[in-house]
């Protein structure tokens, strides 16, 4: 039997100073490319090796990126988020939201919340 | 974990064409950067050609004869090649990652990737 994964989900504001190349990570998202269905939002897939992220060493794959430098990323086309971060600045402020899986309960009933929603 | 395998090598005669594919797994392939590489014998692997969300990027040496592209219905990337010479003689392997990078996106590092297919060797006699 399956057991119900609840989720954990905390924000945070994260402070990266732009490194030699860059801050490091990749995203996925926008209104025109859902990662996650139902939600356009701009998620972390990748931290790259010795990156400004990996060294700073708070932001993580599949968190999502709620602002930048206090702009939000919300109803953003992929690539407009893009170009938002690449020009965000030498010092670049993130709010994120982390989700952490936090136990395995029992199974629930059918029809309970989706996690991903 | 994403799994690369090409397609689509073979010999073929200087001046003819070919078409590559390159398969993925994965049930996110539209936000995959993918990129083509090549590898002659004795040589450094060789950046052929990549596919972002917003553009392609080719090396000079095969500019205006080959073609990138993707079909995100069948989580496939392709690179066509046509006016093919001998020197286009090689295993040409195909690399990706998830997602866009936020920084100076460099297409020939292969840094910038962290998947890669084992090749499908193309030779041009």
């Known amino acids: 039997m399956n057991g119900r994964v609840d989720y954990l989900v905390t924000e945070e504001e994260i402070n990266l100073t732009r490194g030699p190349s860059g801050l490091g990570f990749n995203i996925v998202g926008g209104t025109d490319q859902q990662y996650v269905s139902n939600d356009s939002g701009i998620y972390v897939s990748r931290i790259k090796e010795n990156g400004a992220a990996a060294l700073d060493g708070r932001l993580q794959e599949g968190d999502k990126i709620l602002s930048v430098n206090g702009q939000d990323l919300k109803n953003l086309l992929h690539q407009d988020a893009v170009d938002l971060f690449r020009n965000a600045g030498y010092a670049v402020s993130l709010r994120v939201q982390h989700r952490l899986q936090v136990q395995n309960g029992p199974i629930g009933h059918r029809g309970e919340g989706d996690p991903s929603g | 974990e994403v799994q690369l395998v090409e397609s689509g090598g073979g010999l073929v005669q200087a001046g003819g064409s070919l078409r590559l594919s390159c398969t993925a797994s994965?049930?996110?392939?539209?936000?995959?950067?993918m990129a083509w590489f090549r590898q002659a014998p004795g040589k450094e692997r060789e950046f052929v050609a990549a596919?972002?969300?917003?553009?392609?990027y080719y090396a000079d040496s095969v500019k205006g004869r080959f073609t990138i592209s993707r079909d995100n219905a069948k989580n496939t990337m392709y690179l066509q090649m046509n006016s093919l010479k001998p020197e286009d003689t090689a295993v040409y392997i195909c690399?990706?990652?998830?997602?866009?990078?936020?920084?100076?996106?460099?297409?020939?590092?292969?840094?910038?990737?962290?998947?890669w297919g084992q090749g499908t060797q193309v030779t041009v006699s």
């Open positions: 690399a990706a990652v998830i997602g866009s990078t936020v920084d100076s996106y460099s297409p020939s590092d292969p840094l910038e990737y962290d998947y």
């Open positions: 596919i972002t969300w917003s553009g392609t």
């Open positions: 994965g049930r996110t392939f539209s936000t995959y950067t």
